[in-house]
Interface confidence: low
């Protein structure tokens, strides 16, 4: 990657305009604060890619990091990302704004951190203070990053002087959290139960010999305590388990169950929580919409998918025109219902190489002893259009007729066009569309029939030509949602002794 100007640090004037260019052997992109600002991307004749970022009417808020990176999904190597830092000294901007989460620095161990107070001008002197103290702290400052060091649990502010005024930053709070080395995991036999069923939770701690378990759960708040059982998993050393078992759950037992584990030697502790839902009775609920009309294309495979939530696990049946469907031995139909989470299911009907006979009314029914749901839709088989016949005739009336017949589903549209210059048409001259216009001296009559058994439409269109004084190429084009088909016939005047 080549960046112009190369940086790595630039100081630009407020209100000015500045152009950054990045080029590379693959597509490149400029990034600012994890986003891609508007930029012009190009590819040169020699295969080099470039991106030009124009910064207009610069303010202090444009101060910060700019990255040029390859615009693809491959893992970035070190030379695939160039960093540029731009300062725009702006006396109207004191400290650059921080996101709320940057003001609160949570620590889990004694480690070096950075208080990210940054200014727009690299020449400014910046000092760090405890929030309630005037003494500047002896911590190194990097204008691009902030103050880095090991900090106590306190609140801090940065100060600088711009012109003749002293400016304070927002307060930064350093907060040391006690995170234990205890590794706790909580799981439930089921996180959804019906009232009257049992709730059973397990809290497991690894790597400690002496621990204390404390459970918090909805029933405890009302003073109805449940005695957990603690045991050692003998096949795994230092695996201790606490089991909380609530028989015959009530609706009030819904809520958060927390297992808090402490070990007194180092005063370490950890806790994990899990949500349990107690429902009055079982349920089946459809998720998302499935349109009442679905389409499949003839001879292609089509999967119809229904997503739903249910507890307890339901029975799922599919019907076509009120007849139960099952996996066909010929492999034409495949049914599957997958449990994608504890209570979420995906049921799929796959039609392999769809046939016309598979059009019809489909229903999926999911049910158990407490509830049921069903979803129905009509399946239409779309058939690409075919022109079956294009013929020309000379009735006694003196006019000439061309008849075009074709089929397809959904109903095809018919387009007639003609070309008088056979040598140049249709490559050089566009054909003329024909219709019911007297100018073109042609008349059109179209009939549409729906064939129930084949489940497709037939279109028959007759084009009447009043005066054909020289050979004419007439084209019939049929079009529908899944394709188009064209045939062409040459119509010659009555006087000419041949037909093509």
């Amino acid at each position: 990657l080549v960046v112009t100007p190369p940086g790595p640090e630039l100081v630009l004037n407020v209100s000015s305009t500045f152009v950054l260019t990045c080029s590379g052997s693959a597509p490149v992109v400029w990034e600012r604060m994890s986003q891609e600002p508007p930029q012009e991307m190009a590819k040169a004749q020699d295969g080099t890619f470039s991106s030009v970022l124009t910064l207009t009417n610069l303010t202090g808020l444009d101060t910060g990091e700019y990255f040029c990176t390859h615009n693809d999904s491959r893992g970035l190597e070190t030379d695939e990302r160039k960093r540029l830092y731009i300062f725009v000294p702006d006396p109207t901007v004191g400290f650059l704004p921080n996101d709320a989460e940057e003001l609160f620095i949570f620590l889990t161990e004694i480690t070096e951190i950075t208080i990210p107070c940054r200014v727009t001008d690299p020449q400014l002197v910046v000092t760090l203070h405890e929030k309630k103290g005037d003494v500047a702290l002896p911590v190194p400052y990097d204008h691009q990053r902030g103050f880095s060091g090991i900090f106590e649990d306190r609140s801090y502010i940065c100060k600088t002087t711009i012109g003749d005024r002293e400016v304070d930053s927002d307060a930064y709070y350093v907060y040391r959290l006690q995170v234990s080395s205890i590794n706790v995991s909580v799981n439930a036999v089921q996180t959804v139960v019906r009232q009257g069923e049992n709730i059973t939770l397990m809290c497991i701690v690894i790597g400690n010999e002496v621990v204390n378990f404390e459970w918090t759960y909805p029933r405890k708040e009302s003073g109805r305590l449940v005695e957990p059982v603690t045991d050692f998993l003998l096949d795994m050393p230092y695996h201790i388990r606490s089991i909380l078992h609530i028989p015959s759950a009530e609706l009030e037992d819904s809520g958060t169950y927390t297992c808090n584990v402490t070990e007194s030697v180092n005063d370490h502790q950890d806790e994990k929580a899990i949500n349990i839902t107690v429902v009055e009775s079982g349920y089946v609920r459809l998720l998302g919409e499935v349109g009442t009309l679905q389409f499949a294309e003839l001879h292609r495979s089509r999967t119809l998918q229904v997503v739903f939530e249910a507890y307890p696990p339901p029975t799922v049946l599919w019907f076509k025109d009120n007849r139960t469907l099952g996996d066909s031995s010929a492999g034409e139909i495949a049914l599957s219902t997958r449990n994608v989470s504890e209570t979420r299911y995906v049921s799929e009907l796959t039609l392999v190489r769809v046939k016309v006979a598979e059009a019809g009314h489909y229903t999926m029914r999911a049910f158990h002893e407490d509830a049921e749901v069903q979803l129905s839709f009509q399946l239409q088989i779309n058939v690409p259009v075919r022109v079956l016949e294009l013929s020309e005739s000379h009735p006694d009336s003196g006019e000439q007729t061309v008849r075009c017949r074709g089929r397809g589903m959904p109903q095809p549209n018919i387009i007639w066009s003609a070309c008088r210059d056979l040598k140049r048409c249709p490559r050089e001259l566009p054909p003329t569309l024909l219709g019911n216009s007297s100018e073109e001296e042609s008349q059109l009559e179209t009939n549409v029939t729906y064939w129930e058994e084949e489940q497709e439409f037939e279109v028959v269109s007759t084009l009447r030509l009043q005066h054909v004084d020289r050979p004419l190429s007439v084209r019939c084009t049929l079009r529908n949602a899944v394709g188009q088909d064209t045939q062409e016939v040459i119509v010659v005047p009555h006087s000419l002794p041949f037909k093509v």
Partner: nanobody
């Protein structure tokens, strides 16, 4: 023994404002998280907002963000909930709660001490 006493509830028109107060006593609250919860008739108790006593770091439920504001006055051991643009669905009993582990204030789980609650009714 920790005691929490709420006040400031009442009847207000939709779009109006109320300020709830919670007087905390019985100990110093450094290292505590203080929270407001609410319970509408026939519903579970829901988290509304929390604040850490020492540093004043705040956290809000999505449904009240931008309308409610939590604050504390450590000198007088008070916690406040400023409620603006009130809606009928804000009608509930509002409880003040205290958790001795401030680092947990985002988890909304374990508040060891609770007040008796104050009724807020928003009419349409």
């Amino acid at each position: 023994e920790v005691q929490l006493v709420e006040s400031g509830g009442g009847l207000v028109q939709a779009g109006g404002s109320l300020r709830l107060s919670c007087a905390a006593s019985g100990r110093t609250f450094n290292g505590y998280a203080m929270g407001w919860f609410r319970q509408a008739p026939g519903k579970e108790r829901d988290f509304v907002a929390a604040i850490t006593w020492s540093y004043g770091y705040t956290h809000y439920a999505e449904s009240v963000k931008g309308r409610f504001s939590i604050s504390r006055d450590s000198a007088n051991n008070m916690v406040y909930l400023e409620m603006n643009s009130l809606k009928p669905e804000d009608t509930a009993v509002y409880y003040c709660a205290a958790d001795p582990k401030a680092s947990r204030f985002r988890t909304l789980r374990r508040y060891d001490y609770w007040g008796q609650g104050t009724q807020v009714t928003v009419s349409s």
